[in-house]
Interface confidence: low
């Protein structure tokens, strides 16, 4: 929506004659009729599709026109339009002589025309006036014109509606091209989103007005980056809300129970090692020769049963001595003297003699390990599954459970992202390392070729009554060139009455 403005400045008719050459009596009382229409290569009669306007009598013969209201008429003359400005136009300006006060076309003599000019061309929207002068053999007209947008309309064609606002629905003013310009402290497509206090945590904080930082439940602090621990948490902290992770030495649901009894009370005697094991609970690990809850009782050396594998203990003045049963030796009878004859290999392991029978080694079957084949092998310890697959033990074998997008025994194969034909409108799919890419055919764009990029505004045949459709010069809109007898932006209205002015 906009206005074509025409400012008449000076009209010269020194001899005071009509177009026919006949003089006006007593002088040429001059008024103007203006017709604005769609672009025509050769301006021809027909409906003024963009509008018409006429003036009262502005002067006699030669005169200057004041640039304000004059005798009830307006200067500049206003020709409003409520469609997208097409960028081209045709303009007809006629000067007429009014013998009397009735300026209606039917009240004037047929030869009352003083002069007529017709121009056409391109005209961009803008504040600057185009100054022009048109001279004929007997007259000269100086005038200027421009196209400006109506209030709240912007852009090269006055097609963008934008109304500044500062309320719940948006906080913005309008730029010259009609795009929104957010007021300070606001962002988003319609400037509805406040810009929070600088540093306000993205997930844990929010704001309802600029420079604010309101915390979501479970968070606190100026920037909402400190979690709130469980209510009543005494000696603990949190890394996520409502946790109570106890400081060292404290326990219980609220970290209010003292667990560091060892440090505070030193209950273990005779050089024993103290271990905390709960609230007011501890364990003393006694040195050899001591026993009791706090290792407060002295033992004989053999009271601690130091001899292993069934060895018997003998107290001695300087300690103790172990008498080992057959097949064992060492200070505590801890070493075996078994051989392959004693069948030491478990789970079907094969025994091999070493050092002339003084020792042996077990060769284990699959899935077992250890010096006596006593341990079951975990086949997943080597992390055989690629691309984040999960390893599962399945009896004598293992298997990999793959993440989405991968397959194969060890999840080593990448499933093709193109297999599901994700590219729309005949786009070509290319597998990439981290996803896919679509190559779009002409007329489409977007990550999946889902966006139609070129539109022929005339393709939908918007013009009625056999009118000719032209695509606009600068936007994907249309202009209808109406045949004689029809008007309107789509040539949809028949002219029921004779036209107001005989163009």
């Amino acid at each position: 929506s906009g206005v074509f403005q025409l400012q008449l400045q000076e009209f010269i008719n020194e001899r005071g004659v009509l177009a026919s050459g006949r003089p006006c009596e007593p002088g040429c009382r001059t008024f103007f009729r203006v017709c604005l229409k769609h672009f025509q290569a050769v301006v021809s009669p027909g409906p003024c599709t963009f509008g018409t306007v006429s003036t009262p009598v502005l002067g006699t013969n030669s005169f200057a026109v004041r640039d304000d209201s004059s005798g009830g008429g307006r200067n500049p003359l206003q020709l409003p339009f409520n469609f997208t400005w097409p960028g081209t136009f045709s303009l007809i300006i006629e000067a007429w002589h009014a013998p009397g006060d009735d300026l209606r076309p039917e009240a004037l003599p047929p030869d009352a025309l003083i002069s007529k000019i017709a121009i056409q061309g391109s005209l961009a929207v803008g504040q600057n006036w185009l100054l022009d002068e048109q001279t004929s053999t007997l007259t000269r007209l100086r005038y200027s014109y421009r196209v400006i947008c109506s209030d709240n309309y912007y852009g090269d064609n006055c097609s963008r509606l934008c109304k500044k606002r500062n309320d719940h629905f948006g906080h913005y003013v309008c730029q010259p091209d009609g795009n929104l310009s957010c007021l300070p402290g606001w962002t988003g497509e319609y400037c509805q989103q406040p810009i929070c206090l600088s540093g306000c945590h993205e997930q844990n904080g929010y704001c309802s007005k600029p420079a604010e930082c309101l915390c979501r439940p479970g968070w606190q602090g100026r920037l909402c980056n400190e979690c709130i621990p469980h209510n009543g948490c005494r000696h603990g902290t949190c890394s996520t809300p409502w946790q109570c992770t106890c400081d060292e030495g404290w326990g219980g649901l609220f970290c209010d129970q003292d667990l560091n009894y060892c440090t505070h009370h030193s209950p273990c005697k005779n050089g024993a090692t103290c271990s905390n094991s709960g609230q007011r609970s501890y364990t003393c690990t006694c040195r050899p020769g001591y026993t009791g809850v706090d290792c407060e009782l002295e033992l004989s050396e053999c009271d601690s049963n130091p001899c292993r594998n069934g060895g018997s203990c003998k107290d001695q003045e300087d300690g103790y001595h172990c008498l080992c049963p057959p097949g064992y030796y060492g200070l505590h009878c801890e070493h075996s003297t078994l051989s392959c004859a004693d069948s030491p290999c478990f789970n079907g392991g094969s025994c091999r003699e070493r050092n002339q029978g003084a020792n042996y080694a077990c060769e284990c079957p699959p899935n077992f390990t250890g010096s006596n084949c006593e341990k079951k092998v975990d086949r997943c310890t080597s992390n055989p599954c690629a691309n984040g697959g999960q390893c599962l033990n399945r009896g004598p074998s293992r298997m990999c459970r793959c993440r989405p997008g991968f397959t194969g025994t060890y999840c080593e194969l990448h499933v093709s992202d193109c297999a599901r034909n994700p590219c729309a409108h005949g786009g070509t799919c290319h597998d990439l390392e981290n996803g896919l890419m679509c190559t779009c055919p002409a007329g489409f764009s977007g990550r999946r070729c889902e966006v139609r990029t070129s539109i022929d505004a005339c393709a939908s045949s918007p013009c009625f009554n056999r009118a000719t459709c032209y695509t606009d010069l600068s936007t994907d809109t249309f202009v209808c060139n109406c045949p004689y007898g029809f008007v309107g932006s789509r040539c949809e209205f028949p002219v029921g009455l004779p036209p107001s002015f005989p163009w």
Epitope: I119, G121, S122, L123, D132, L473
Partner: nanobody, 116 residues
């Protein structure tokens, strides 16, 4: 006063191409709206294409997609690239310019003949 000189016309077979040039003598070429018109024998002169001071282009339906109008303000020259020529494109092609769309200036014309 503005002088316009067209060149580049000639005889070409249907489906061929030609490039017309229009050189303008005048220091304010960039502020002129430029256009190409043509007149076939026994017919009215018709608009082919025009280009605004900002480079906005307009084409007659009969040449859309085949002809391309352009201007080089540094060389004070306007061009018309004509592809996929048809016998019905045969005409005298005129270069036209307007200062503020009122003062009309025309070149002398260049003949384009398309044989079938």
């Amino acid at each position: 006063e503005v002088q316009l000189v067209e060149s580049g016309g000639g005889l070409v077979q249907a489906g061929g191409s030609l490039r017309l040039s229009c050189a303008a003598a005048g220091s304010t070429f960039s502020s002129y709206v430029m256009g190409w018109y043509r007149q076939a024998p026994g017919k009215q002169r018709e608009l082919v294409a025009h280009i605004s001071t900002r480079g906005i282009t307009y084409y007659a339906d009969s040449v859309k997609g085949r002809f391309t109008i352009s201007r080089d303000n540094a060389k004070n020259t306007m061009y018309l690239q004509m592809n996929s020529l048809k016998p019905e494109d045969t005409a005298v092609y005129y270069c036209n310019t307007r200062r503020n769309f009122l003062s009309n200036y025309w070149g002398q014309g260049t003949q384009v003949t398309v044989s079938s």
